[in-house]
Interface confidence: medium
Amino acid sequence: KSSNEATNITPKHNMKAFLDELKAENIKKFLYNFTQIPHLAGTEQNFQLAKQIQSQWKEFGLDSVELAHYDVLLSYPNKTHPNYISIINEDGNEIFNTSLFEPPPPGYENVSDIVPPFSAFSPQGMPEGDLVYVNYARTEDFFKLERDMKINCSGKIVIARYGKVFRGNKVKNAQLAGAKGVILYSDPADYFAPGVKSYPDGWNLPGGGVQRGNILNLNGAGDPLTPGYPANEYAYRRGIAEAVGLPSIPVHPIGYYDAQKLLEKMGGSAPPDSSWRGSLKVPYNVGPGFTGNFSTQKVKMHIHSTNEVTRIYNVIGTLRGAVEPDRYVILGGHRDSWVFGGIDPQSGAAVVHEIVRSFGTLKKEGWRPRRTILFASWDAEEFGLLGSTEWAEENSRLLQERGVAYINADSSIEGNYTLRVDCTPLMYSLVHNLTKELKSPDEGFEGKSLYESWTKKSPSPEFSGMPRISKLGSGNDFEVFFQRLGIASGRARYTKNWETNKFSGYPLYHSVYETYELVEKFYDPMFKYHLTVAQVRGGMVFELANSIVLPFDCRDYAVVLRKYADKIYSISMKHPQEMKTYSVSFDSLFSAVKNFTEIASKFSERLQDFDKSNPIVLRMMNDQLMFLERAFIDPLGLPDRPFYRHVIYAPSSHNKYAGESFPGIYDALFDIESKVDPSKAWGEVKRQIYVAAFTVQAAAETLSEVA
């Protein structure tokens, strides 16, 4: 119980005091306050909210609260020239047009500045052509189309359903397939849970609802015009042609009412199998083009959005540490929303606000954490994690030397079934121990721990009696801290039952219907799940900032490294002949993992025994723990992804949201049977095994006795 030993501690000022100060009613009040108008990045409304949060954090008692601004590339629809899609007849007349906006929810009819649905960073264009339905537009969907069905998407407009993978990956795949435009839509199979009413009568997506979102492929670059460096006053900006990650073809999102009109006329090939059928009453024919009677009709896109360099504002609050002020524990979540942000991000921002208030209350009573806590309200997350990335680029030298941990705080809920945690293996034991001390908010688990309900509802696939904890991927503001800088990171939220709800995310994600009422009426009327998430996020920050010894267990990294090595080896072993031909061996990797395991075990033994009253030795041991995550960083980055530098984890090349283990080896092996030069391809596999083995061995040595 190391927290109670922190400096200036009185019996009152422990983790319990911090947790007891967190109140569901406050979170509810903050959520309401943050969701009454839109807070789109780059707008005056979001600047005003930044100043309000700055003022309130100061009132709560933080030592300093500053705004950090950057001028980054954002994207907006043209207010006088709206985006839409039409069906045109042989004379070029528009016989059907998609809707220009979502019908506003009750009570919000007179709200101004609701940005209509658009795909941020789409280039302008008015392509017309035949439609091809490409399912989810995943890598495997295009393999099915091109290789098995011999359907050529070149010069076609593709229509893809949202879900399964990040929308930017869908657009990248469509571009590579030669498409000249992309239509994204929400199918009820993915965004309508059976038996639940659509908003405002329930939490399902109505037919006119549309998911907004950026379609970039930044690969961790941040602002597309200033990759690697902050977008400050004296920044050198690339020309738009050299900008990182921008799509090259027009893209636009629609709802399922409009999708029905496009899909019901589709002809050409039948869907290859049932996994290509959604839940609209249409044949889900792949195309290309419309069926018999409608074969002369085409689809035309009208996209007029513009990219603009715009000022954004992060709010950075500091609570100075009493003993190790040069060690930073960071709690950050974004503030910008697509519209009202009822869930994304304000359910998270409201929790951060209450955590700041609780810490501030303790500080006013004379307490300080051992280490410095930084609180961040990030801007422009929705436009590519821009606020967090620019700040981290500006402060990278400090962060890589002083960063202990980063806890992310976007949406607190995506359901109300059980806890969901993604984090570095270093934090597994912290999360386990913390959740054992917290009460479960779940029905049927009264008087039981959060750990118990979580484990029951979301069991680990590998270890019985333990809950599932997932790998970190991307798509949120931890990316730069973890994937680029190698700072131990974690995230927690309440989620849905993935077994019974197969829809992607939550149905109203990034739509106008993501309101305060959605949360208050349907997801969490008592705000008990929000409170639990506040306790988890806040509790992690408290322990990370206050424990005498950092609450990291390096042995858990050893366990997963072995698991990941086994997994990548088994993928490679699908090609036994080639492994023999090209002398591909994983011995070096397994040897490095074995060494890591032994050294981590010895380090853990020393950690139990060392003299904690010796501040030099304590600092030395803590630094070895802090820098372990950093040791997995390869300064050269992954191939073609220089800002993804973590050798053990990276966002999947096929889905930014998902984490991939040993990503360098994985990508080298992916679809290797189709490579034109197998010798070169297997040579790259060998090189990636070498990089991984070296990195694991080098990381292990950072845990060895220093002399």
Epitope: P188, P194, P206, S279
Partner: antibody, heavy 124, light 109 residues
Framework: QVQLVQSGGGLVQPGGSLRLSCAAS????????MSWVRQAPGKGLEWVAN????????YYVDSVKGRFTISRDNAKNSLYLQMNSLRAEDTAVYYC?????????????????WGQGTMVTVSS | AIRMTQSPSSVSASVGDRVTITCRAS??????LAWYQQKPGKAPKLLIY???SLQSGVPSRFSGSGSGTDFTLTISSLKPEDFATYYC???????????FGGGTKVEIK
């Protein structure tokens, strides 16, 4: 509680008319498609007609088109079936039923609430 | 119009038996299928929707499966109250048309 209560059945001669009524309670009647389903003696179920929430769309099985009219009065929470030019083969128990749009707006997939049924006998 | 063919038209079974009823659509209907139970002199009762989703309050011994053209209703262990007639119904062509299968009577052996 949620229920549908029917009235208006009876014996009628071929060529005659009859009006069936269905009173809804316990739910927001105006939010649902509604239907009539019938069952001839000793036979299976046959869908007869559908009407949209606001009455703007109506659909009928081929065998009753031009003879039967489905209608609703949302202010009275009531559904109606006006049956004209009745034939012997129209003899059946008629059920009103709520169409549950469980999958997405107006997809109308299953009949989750049924009336108790009313017998219509067409005979000379 | 979509035709729904149920088989068998009747089945004799004992309490505790596993009973399987099939329904075939004349063309693909995705998962737009519901199953009903009807007892003599009573209105039908919804058991399964979306081919496999159990309606609230229906015992878990009832289950549905299938997609496209072939569907199955299974009663895992027959109870005395399960002796009735069962109907499938497609809604792929809603709202223009709805079709029921001919029914399967589950009788006491």
């Amino acid at each position: 509680q949620v229920q549908l209560v029917q009235s208006g059945g009876g014996l009628v001669q071929p060529g005659g008319s009859l009006r069936l009524s269905c009173a809804a309670s316990g739910f927001t009647f105006s939010s649902y498609w509604m239907s009539w389903v019938r069952q001839a003696p000793g036979k299976g179920l046959e869908w007869v007609a559908n009407i949209k929430q606001d009455g703007s769309e109506k659909y009928y099985v081929d065998s009753v088109k031009g003879r039967f009219t489905i209608s609703r009065d949302n202010a009275k929470n009531s559904l109606y079936l006006q049956m004209n030019s009745l034939r012997a083969e129209d003899t059946a128990v008629y059920y009103c039923a709520r169409v549950w749009d469980y999958y997405y707006d107006s997809s109308g997939d299953a009949f989750d609430i049924w009336g108790q049924g009313t017998m219509v006998t067409v005979s000379s | 119009a979509i035709r729904m063919t149920q088989s068998p038209s009747s089945v004799s079974a004992s309490v505790g038996d596993r009973v399987t009823i099939t329904c075939r659509a004349s063309q693909g209907i995705s998962s737009w299928l519901a199953w009903y139970q009807q007892k003599p002199g009573k209105a039908p009762k919804l058991l399964i929707y979306a081919a496999s989703s159990l309606q609230s309050g229906v015992p878990s011994r009832f289950s549905g499966s299938g997609s496209g053209t072939d569907f199955t209703l299974t009663i895992s262990s027959l109870k005395p109250e399960d002796f009735a007639t069962y109907y499938c119904q497609q809604a792929n062509s809603f709202p223009r048309a709805l079709t029921f299968g001919g029914g399967t009577k589950v009788e006491i052996k």
